[in-house]
Amino acid sequence: MMCLECASAAAGGAEEEEADAERRRRRRGAQPGAGGSACCGARGVGGAGVVSADEEVQTLSGSVRRVPSGLPSIPSTPGCAAAAKGPSAPQPKPASLGRGRGAAAAILSLGNVLNYLDRYTVAGVLLDIQQHFGVKDRGAGLLQSVFICSFMVAAPIFGYLGDRFNRKVILSCGIFFWSAVTFSSSFIPQQYFWLLVLSRGLVGIGEASYSTIAPTIIGDLFTKNTRTLMLSVFYFAIPLGSGLGYITGSSVKQAAGDWHWALRVSPVLGMITGTLILILVPATKRGHADQLGGQLKARTSWLRDMKALIRNRSYVFSSLATSAVSFATGALGMWIPLYLHRAQVVQKTAETCNSPPCGAKDSLIFGAITCFTGFLGVVTGAGATRWCRLRTQRADPLVCAVGMLGSAIFICLIFVAAKTSIVGAYICIFVGETLLFSNWAITADILMYVVIPTRRATAVALQSFTSHLLGDAGSPYLIGFISDLIRQSTKDSPLWEFLSLGYALMLCPFVVVLGGMFFLATALFFLSDRAKAEQQVNQLVMPPASVKV
């Protein structure tokens, strides 16, 4: 597996990556062009200067490379038969490797689609699950809470493991695990609701392994704009998977005449994807794309990683901003369909709902909008960032900040428009969500820039934990609580049902504005933190010649 500089040209040529690589080589005092296109530790197939697989020594904290005997003690930078031939020898850039990395990113993205497809298939048949098991609303809330809590708790654990052990094995095991659990859960008898709760908790653990580790592999396969693009594809999987989950849930239920079959689709696809990950995703070294040769030193302790992340201001502020996004999406996703239904009751275009599901049509429209705006947001965000990077080095956090602040305006306008026009409200939702979702991939990219490769899985995990804890774990309940509080002090009428929920939801744009402020704060520290991370990577790299085995 060759690093980005070798393969990106084959995949369409990335001049800026080459220039960036050249700059870094000069910083390390390497001769320009030495070793041809200085690539990262590839597993060779024998041959001069290429390290074969058996020359790699696995340790608990990573792997070190034995220098093949009979070779000069040069940094084992693959590509490296070329180094033996001399600097003038042009290095061929095999297209297959570019395709291989593209395929790896595609499979990882497919895995993410399945992650969310599985999660939202359950949402798609939740009413059937509630009906079958006799689950009350508090029970449905328990299912969601158990999932989020187990996900939150498991994420830092997998972050720790992901920075220290074989990531693709952890990924595949995670997929196999949640697939098996979801499949088994389709056979749970009616009297064992607690087993269903347990299964959702276990699925949360399985999915946490994927969500925390997969982005770091993409981060190690690509850099700069290519990485932004690939992360965009990876994060587009969220709305795509969510939308497909709803569709799969309802359509499989209708086709089979039994909701149980809906829970048997994603596990089968999951098993296939897990196998493909094992076969096709390369066992990339941490910092593969960033470091250009050499070998990263042994991993630091988890406590030291946490201290470093907490001191990393760009990381902290972007994580808080992500929490704000999570808060808003969690609350809006839960309450907007009901809010719009109540708006129609007030406008006398719909009847008061006494028997749930209330606002089913609005849920469907909102789901479709979320799915499409997720795609549009990711594309818009990535495109805007690429364009802005030509003008400022702080493009990433600034694009996020603008997106958040713009989103807050349109979220506010939802509540203005809903009083008179449902179509107007939907337009505001469309624009607001597009802007809100525009920072998904960019936030991940910011993390890749400011966190060193050996800490990335822990960083993703901690960010995931924080965004759930401060975001969607509590926001739906908080909005409901505020709405009930307002209603207690007003007269019981459809108008006040509508207004109280609207006033409660007004908390969302304020939180989004706060998130925008956090992104602006990220912009202040972004360049210094990025430089620090690059400097740390350079310090972490040591030539394998000096490694005592």
């Epitope: 006799g134 609303d137 508090r138 328990l142 609701f193």
Partner: antibody, heavy 125, light 107 residues
């Protein structure tokens, strides 16, 4: 001790209305799902209607044979469940039982763990 | 709707004998079956829930088994108070349905 007491039965003409009431005691009514089950003379049991608790938005479910004619409702403050029967037919003649579903806080069983003594409704011209 | 068939409609036994009452569902319903006893001029009472789970206060001679479509209610050494009608009920899906009943009578 759990108690379910039905009242409101009697003899009515086809097409007329009747409201059955079930007074409950000995358990937390507001958290419990309640149903009406009927039994025509010399025949088997037939489920009529179910009303869930407020934590399930007091959702109601009905048997196809009575849908649109009967309405189940509850009053948590009085611990009572009702069955409003409109457009009554001859085939609605039966003993109507008020039943309780076993409750497990987060979920409820669909089976009936307690039954009232029943109330007779006769529809005849 | 899920249809339940009980057999035999009537079962004549002598006290002290052991019997098995059958209930068959029109489709697979896992273990979502429940058994009730209705003595003459009385309200029904729950005997067994979820195919095999016993109920507090119900004599241990009553037991249930089965899964999928075929279910059995067994009465070990029938006593005089057991002569009544037995109904099975499914809760796998709405509408909730009952079997037509099996009448246990003295031989």
């Amino acid at each position: 001790e759990v108690q379910l007491v039905e009242t409101g039965g009697g003899l009515v003409r086809p097409g007329s209305s009747l409201k059955l009431s079930c007074a409950t005691s000995g358990f937390t009514f507001s958290d419990t799902w309640m149903s009406w089950v009927r039994q025509a003379p010399g025949k088997g049991l037939e489920w009529v209607a179910l009303i869930k608790d407020k934590n399930s938005n007091s959702e109601a479910n009905y048997a196809e044979s009575i849908k649109g004619r009967f309405t189940i409702s509850r009053d948590d403050s009085k611990s009572r469940v009702y069955l409003q029967m409109n457009t009554l037919r001859d085939q609605d003649t039966a003993t109507y039982y008020c039943t309780r579903h076993e409750d497990f806080y987060y979920y409820s069983g669909y089976y009936f763990d307690y039954w009232g003594q029943g109330v007779m409704v006769t529809v005849s011209s | 709707d899920i249809v339940l068939t009980q057999s035999p409609p009537t079962l004549s036994v002598t006290p002290g004998e052991s019997v098995s009452l059958s209930c068959r569902a029109s489709q697979g319903i896992s273990t979502s079956i429940h058994w009730y006893q209705q003595r003459s001029n009385e309200s029904p009472r729950l005997l067994i829930k979820y195919a095999s789970q016993s109920i507090a206060g119900i004599p241990s001679r009553f037991s249930g088994s089965g899964s999928g479509t075929d279910f059995i209610l067994s009465i070990n050494r029938v006593e005089s108070e057991d002569f009544s009608v037995y109904y099975c009920q499914q809760t796998y899906s709405l509408p909730l349905t009952f079997g037509p009943g099996t009448k246990l009578e003295v031989k």
